[in-house]
């Protein structure tokens, strides 16, 4: 890979010194390094009106390196660029600029948003949610027995969180009222949520009202039905055999 040197070849300065410092192979008092020791990068730094040659193990910020056969040379990136692949392609912009497709911009183009962590223009990401999971069993105060009217809940997962300018996520919990055939609680039965239960078709006249609720919580006020239920549970001493609950699936 020998270089053929043209008429513009750099001539050695009259003050060329062999006693060079800092990785220089040849140098001059006026221009600093003129060439570097193997594997070091040659960079011209402007100091006032003068350009001083310096030899470094890698190119400084704002420069990129080219390993020619006869010289490793640092070339300046564009003024707004901190790290670049070459003159055309910046990979990290200086403070206050956003990187977009190899260019440094004051503001991100329409349809993109600034990521202030990476300082890049990125696509706006909208929220994505899964399909609803099935409704939970009809429960009341954590129990699945000893009541007629309760609530059931369903949830869905956030598949993709939105970026700053993206559409916000819709509610991920939904709670609605449900009516079941009252069944007595057996002694010690806790009837916790999540217990598998066969679902039957709704009884005539029974219905449920869907109440979307982003927090997935019913109102904390006690209804007359809830009070009645409590009293009945207190009065019960003898438990009947467990009845299967009937969940009503009509939604208005």
């Amino acid at each position: 890979q020998n270089a053929s040197r043209g008429r513009r070849q750099r001539r050695m300065h009259p003050n060329v010194s062999q006693g060079c410092q800092g990785g220089c192979a040849t140098c001059s008092d006026y221009n600093g390094c003129l060439s570097c020791k193997p594997r070091l990068f040659f960079v011209l730094e402007r100091i006032g009106m003068k350009q001083i040659g310096v030899c470094l193990s890698s190119c400084p910020s704002g420069y990129y390196g080219t390993r020619y056969p006869d010289i490793n040379k640092c070339t300046k990136c564009k003024a707004d660029c901190d790290t670049c692949f070459n003159k055309n392609f910046c990979t990290k912009c200086k403070s206050g600029f956003y990187l977009h497709l190899g260019k440094c911009l004051d503001n991100c183009p329409e349809g993109l948003e600034a990521n202030n962590h990476t300082m890049e223009c990125v696509n706006i990401v909208h929220c994505e949610v899964s399909e609803w999971n099935p409704w939970s069993p009809c429960t009341k105060k954590g129990k699945t027995c000893g009541f007629k009217r309760g609530t059931e809940t369903r949830v869905r997962e956030i598949m993709q969180h939105p970026s700053a300018k993206g559409n916000l996520c819709p509610p991920t919990n939904e709670t609605r009222k449900c009516t079941v055939q009252r069944k007595k609680c057996q002694k010690g039965e806790r009837g916790k949520k999540g217990r598998e239960r066969k679902r039957k078709k709704p009884n005539k006249g029974e219905s449920k009202e869907a109440i979307p609720d982003s927090k997935g919580l019913e109102s904390s006020k006690e209804t007359p039905e809830q009070r009645e239920n409590k009293q009945q549970q207190k009065k019960r001493k003898v438990q009947d055999k467990q009845q299967k609950s009937v969940s009503v699936s009509t939604v208005h």
């Epitope: 890979q1 270089a3 053929s4 040197r5 043209g6 008429r7 513009r8 070849q9 750099r10 990129y64 080219t66 390993r67 020619y68 056969p69 006869d70 692949f85 070459n86 003159k87 055309n88 392609f89 990979t91």
Partner: antibody, heavy 116, light 107 residues
Framework: EVQLVESGGGVVQPGRSLRLSCAAS????????MAWVRQAPGKGLEWVAT????????YFGDSVRGRFTISRDNSKNTLYLQMNSLRAEDTAVYYC?????????WGQGTMVTVSS | DIQMTQSPSSLSASVGDRVTITCLVS??????FVWYQQKPGKAPKLLIY???RLQDGVPSRFSGSGSGTDFTLTISSLQPEDFATYYC?????????FGQGTKLEIK
């Protein structure tokens, strides 16, 4: 819009010479190292030669060193490739390209056929 | 010189397929690596630079990854216009060297 337009290709006998030219526009020609890359029929890409931005240094691939010379005229935004002692294996499309680590801009290519 | 081993040399795929092309480099080149696309009778076009960065105008279905000696070009969902030949190139040092190319054909 960046444009690189090659010319000078054609059919030439082995041992003869040919000079390719490349007219550049749409970018600051004098800021860029320029190169020639060739592609033999049905084959891959092969780097031929690069000349640095100011014309002071040039580099050549092993297969052409000593036979080809690369030059440029920054006042005319033109790149040249002088090909001497041509061989059958030099038959290829020759592309003019701006070479800055990657080959960022390409011409449409000019075909050189070396045949007796 | 740095050697580039690109595989496969040819590949048949259908529209909508996910396709991966790999390039192995004979020495550590950090991320000084480029991918090109070439269509018949046309000049190569730079697709990806610095191993993973998309050139302006290149669709986001193209992506590049890797560092050191192993590099990959992925097309997430092939489109009719993607059937072409793809070349890798190391930009780490002279002489610049290319992979042998991968011809992507319609199945």
């Amino acid at each position: 819009e960046v444009q690189l337009v090659e010319s000078g290709g054609g059919v030439v006998q082995p041992g003869r010479s040919l000079r390719l030219s490349c007219a550049a526009s749409g970018f600051t020609f004098s800021d860029y190292d320029m190169a020639w890359v060739r592609q033999a029929p049905g084959k891959g890409l092969e780097w031929v030669a690069t000349i640095i931005y100011d014309g002071s240094r040039a580099y050549f691939g092993d297969s052409v060193r000593g036979r080809f010379t690369i030059s440029r005229d920054n006042s005319k935004n033109t790149l040249y490739l002088q090909m001497n002692s041509l061989r059958a294996e030099d038959t290829a499309v020759y592309y003019c390209t701006a070479h800055d680590r990657s080959f960022d801009y390409w011409g449409q290519g000019t075909m050189v056929t070396v045949s007796s | 010189d740095i050697q580039m081993t690109q595989s496969p040399s040819s590949l048949s795929a259908s529209v909508g397929d996910r396709v991966t092309i790999t390039c192995l480099v004979s020495e550590d080149i950090s991320n000084d690596f480029v991918w090109y696309q070439q269509k018949p009778g046309k000049a190569p076009k730079l697709l990806i630079y610095a191993a993973s960065r998309l050139q302006d105008g290149v669709p986001s279905r193209f992506s590049g990854s890797g560092s050191g000696t192993d590099f990959t070009l992925t097309i997430s969902s092939l489109q009719p216009e993607d059937f072409a030949t793809y070349y890798c190139q190391q930009s780490y040092k002279y002489p610049p060297t290319f992979g042998q190319g991968t011809k992507l054909e319609i199945k």
